[in-house]
C-alpha cells in the first residue's frame, strides 16, 4: 500500500492489499477502495473498459472474462490498481485476434492469461509449423506476447499463444499477423509518355504509374507553376503483398494552346518523394518543317553517286511523300522512314539515291510531303560536273580557226602553237574572240564555249592546239600547217583527248 505524507493527497488504498489476486472461476470477486475522495473503479482488459461508481466492486460469480486490471481513482486523479486473474481451466487465454504489426516495430499478440501459474507461455506456429528463426518474443501474462521488431517476411504468419497445463500444450485461438511495411525507398513513378503534341480540340490524356510497398503512398498530378487542382482518375492493384501499383490518369478533354506546359506527377511516402514530368504542346494547326541534311546546291562528278537527304518534322504524321525530277515522280530509288521508333516521334528521314549520274541528269530534284493540315517542299539543284568535250574545230572562210567546247563547269579554251616537229606546244596564242553560247539543253546542263584565233599569224609549218579544260579534265584538238611557197597547204585538224 502507498505511504502517506501528512498534508499531501495520497492514492486510494485497495483491499485486498496485493498487486495480483487469483480467484477461481465461479468464486466471488470483492474489491474495496478506501479513500475520502473516492471517485470510481475502472476495469480494463484488452480493449474493454468498465466503470463503477461504488467504492466496493463485487462480482458474485467470476468468469474468465473478469480477468484484468481494476483501478480505483480519487478526486485528485491519484489511483491504485490490482490485477485479478480468474483461473478457468477451460479458458486459459483472453484473446483479441486482430494482429497488425508495423515493419521494424514491436507488436503485441493480445492473449493475456487467466492463470499466471501455467508454464511455457510462448508463441507457436499454426499446425506445429516452426516460427521464423529470427522471430523474438517477450511474454507478459497480463498483456500478451510482444513480438520484437516485426519483419516483412512475417506477413500472414499464423500463430497461437501456447502454455503447458498439466504437461500438455494448450493453444489459444489462431492469430494471423498482418504486417504494414515500412517505406524504405521513395516511390517509383513513371509516365506513359514524356511529351505530347496535340492540335487544338484534341483530348490530352496521360497516365502516371506509381509503385510502392503499400497503398498509403500519396500521389498527385500538378501543373508546374500553378496551384490549380487537376482532375485525375485512379486505378490501383495489389500485385502480391508488398507490391502496390496505382495509375493516376490526367485528362483534358479538349486541349487549348494555353494548356501547353509541363505537368508533374508527384508521389511521396514517409521515406521521401519522387516525381516525373511530361510536356504538353498544343498547336492551333499541324505543321511540316523540312531540314536538308546536305547543301541544296549539289555538285557531283559525271558517273558518280549522290544521296539527297532530308529530315522533316511532321505533325500530324505525314500522309504523302514524293521525289520529283523534270515533272516525273520517282517510284523507286528512295526511302522514307521515322527518325526513331519512339511513339512520340514526329521526325522523319527521306533519302533519294542517285546513281552513276550522267551529264544530262543535272537539274532540280524536289521532295514534297504533306499531312492532313499542310504541304511542304524542298528543292535540290544538282549540277553534274563533266569533262569538256570539243564539239567543233574548224578553219573558217575568213581564216579564223574556231574551237567550240562543252562541259561543266564552264570550260576554258587555251590555244598553243608548236613550230615544226616539236611535240610540245608551249607558245600560247591569244584568242581573237571568246563567247559563251546558250545551250539548247535543260538548265544545269553543260556550258558551251566558243573560242577563235586568226590563222594568218602563223608563218611556219607547225601544229596549233586548242585545249579545253575545267575542274574535271581537259581535251585537245590540233590543226596541222604546211607551207608550199607562200601558200598555206591544207590544214588537217585532228584531236587528241587527254584524260
Amino acid at each position: 500500500q502507498p505511504s502517506v505524507s501528512p498534508g499531501e493527497p495520497s492514492p486510494p488504498s485497495i483491499h485486498p492489499g496485493k498487486s495480483d489476486l487469483i480467484v477461481r472461476v465461479g468464486d466471488e470477486i470483492r474489491l474495496l477502495c478506501t479513500d475520502p475522495g473516492f471517485v470510481k473503479w475502472t476495469f480494463e482488459i484488452l480493449d474493454e473498459t468498465n466503470e463503477n461508481k461504488q467504492n466496493e466492486w463485487i462480482t458474485e460469480k467470476a468468469e474468465a472474462t473478469n480477468t484484468g486490471k481494476y483501478t480505483c481513482t480519487n478526486k485528485h486523479g491519484l489511483s491504485n490498481s490490482i490485477y485479478v486473474f480468474v483461473r478457468d481451466p477451460a479458458k486459459l487465454f483472453l484473446v483479441d485476434r486482430s494482429l497488425y504489426g508495423k515493419e521494424d516495430n514491436d507488436t503485441l499478440v493480445r492473449c493475456p492469461l487467466t492463470d499466471p501459474e501455467v508454464t511455457n507461455y510462448s508463441l507457436k506456429g499454426c499446425q506445429g509449423k516452426p516460427l521464423p528463426k529470427d522471430l523474438r518474443f517477450i511474454p507478459d501474462p497480463k498483456a500478451g506476447i510482444m513480438i520484437k521488431s516485426v519483419k516483412r517476411a512475417y506477413h500472414r504468419l499464423c500463430l497461437h499463444c501456447s502454455v503447458d497445463q498439466e504437461g500438455k500444450s494448450v493453444l489459444s485461438e489462431k492469430f494471423i499477423l498482418k504486417v504494414r511495411p515500412a517505406f524504405k525507398a521513395v516511390p517509383v513513378v513513371s509516365v506513359s509518355k514524356a511529351s505530347y503534341l496535340l492540335r487544338e480540340g484534341e483530348e490530352f490524356t496521360v497516365t502516371c504509374t506509381i509503385k510502392d510497398v503499400s497503398s498509403s503512398v500519396y500521389s498527385t498530378w500538378k501543373r508546374e507553376n500553378s496551384q490549380t487542382k487537376l482532375q485525375e482518375k485512379y486505378n490501383s492493384w495489389h500485385h502480391g503483398d508488398f507490391n502496390y501499383e496505382r495509375q493516376a490518369t490526367l485528362t483534358i478533354s479538349s486541349a487549348r494552346v494555353n494548356d501547353s506546359g509541363v505537368f508533374m506527377c508527384y508521389a511521396n511516402n514517409t521515406f521521401g518523394s519522387a516525381n516525373v514530368t511530361t510536356t504538353l504542346e498544343v498547336v492551333d494547326k499541324g505543321f511540316i518543317n523540312i531540314f536538308p541534311m546536305i547543301n541544296t546546291t549539289v555538285f557531283v562528278n559525271d558517273g558518280e553517286n549522290v544521296d539527297l537527304i532530308v529530315e522533316y518534322e511532321a505533325f500530324p504524321k505525314p500522309e504523302h511523300q514524293q521525289w520529283i525530277y523534270m515533272n516525273r515522280t520517282f517510284t523507286d530509288k528512295w526511302e522514307d522512314y521515322p527518325k526513331s521508333e519512339n511513339e512520340s516521334n514526329i521526325r522523319y528521314v527521306s533519302e533519294l539515291h542517285l546513281t552513276r549520274l550522267k551529264g544530262t541528269e543535272g537539274g532540280t530534284y524536289t521532295f514534297l510531303v504533306s499531312n492532313s493540315d499542310v504541304n511542304a517542299a524542298i528543292a535540290f539543284n544538282v549540277y553534274v560536273n563533266t569533262k569538256p568535250e570539243i564539239l567543233t574545230y574548224d578553219r573558217l572562210v575568213n581564216g579564223m580557226l574556231q574551237c567550240v567546247a562543252a562541259g561543266f563547269p564552264e570550260p576554258t579554251i587555251d590555244w598553243y602553237f608548236c613550230p615544226g616537229t616539236e611535240q610540245r606546244c608551249s607558245a600560247s596564242v591569244l584568242p581573237v574572240d571568246v563567247q559563251t553560247l546558250n545551250s539548247s539543253g535543260p538548265p544545269f546542263g553543260k556550258l558551251v564555249v566558243q573560242s577563235s584565233i586568226d590563222s594568218s599569224a602563223f608563218k611556219h609549218n607547225g601544229t596549233v592546239e586548242c585545249k579545253a579544260y575545267n575542274d574535271v579534265g581537259k581535251t585537245s584538238a590540233y590543226f596541222n600547217f604546211a607551207f608550199k611557197g607562200n601558200n598555206k597547204e591544207q590544214i588537217h585538224p585532228h584531236t587528241l583527248f587527254t584524260p
Epitope: Q127, G128, K168
Partner: antibody, heavy 116, light 108 residues
Framework: QIQLVQSGPELKKPGESVKISCKAS????????IHWVKQAPGQGLRWMAW????????TYADDFKGRFVFSLEASASTAHLQISNLKNEDTATFFC?????????WGQGTLVTVSS | SYELIQPPSASVTLENTVSITCSGD??????AHWYQQKPDKTILEVIY???ERPSGISDRFSGSSSGTTAILTIRDAQAEDEADYYC???????????FGGGTKLTVL
Amino acid sequence: QIQLVQSGPELKKPGESVKISCKASGYTFTDYAIHWVKQAPGQGLRWMAWINTETGKPTYADDFKGRFVFSLEASASTAHLQISNLKNEDTATFFCAGGSHWFAYWGQGTLVTVSS
Amino acid sequence: SYELIQPPSASVTLENTVSITCSGDELSNKYAHWYQQKPDKTILEVIYNDSERPSGISDRFSGSSSGTTAILTIRDAQAEDEADYYCLSTFSDDDLPIFGGGTKLTVL
C-alpha cells in the same frame, strides 16, 4: 500422452491400391498437421506431404503428386494415405508424424510391400 | 534442388563425445531439427529448433547452429545411442520440409 498409431503392414500386387491410416490421440487433432514420410528399404527418410488438419488441405513434395492421396477423418482423429496403381518402387515403410513442432511425435510406421 | 548434407557415418567410443553436422544454404535462417531412428525403425525427436530438447530426452543430447551448419552433439555416448540420425529443415517460402541423408552412428 500424445500418440500416433498406424495401421498394420500391407502386401500388394503392382497396379493395386493401398490405404493406410494414422490415428492420433492425446491432443486436439486439429491443432497440429500430420506429415507423411517414406523410407524405402536401406534408404533414408523422404518427406512426402503434410496435411492441414484444420482445413484438410494437403501440401505435397513434387515427387508425390498424382498417385498419392492424403486425407483426413477428423471425427476419428485419423489421417489416411492412399496410393493407387502401386509400383515395385512403392515398397517402403511409411511413417506419419505430427505435434507441436511438426515432427515431434512419430507413428511406428507401416510397411507396404509391392510384389507380383 | 535444395539439399541437407550429412556425413553418411560417424563413430564414437563409449562415454565419449561425438558431433554430427548438417549443412544447407538455408540453415542460417531456418531451424534444424534432429531425429533418432533405432534399428527397430522407431523414430524419436531429440532436438528441435536448432537447440531445444523435448521433454524426456537425455541432456546428453544438445544442438547448435552456426551459419549454414547445424550440429548435433552427443556427450558421454552410450550403447543405446547407436542409431541413424537425421536432420530436417525447411526450404522455400512455403517452408517445405526436407531431410538430410542420415548419419549412421556406431558406438565402439
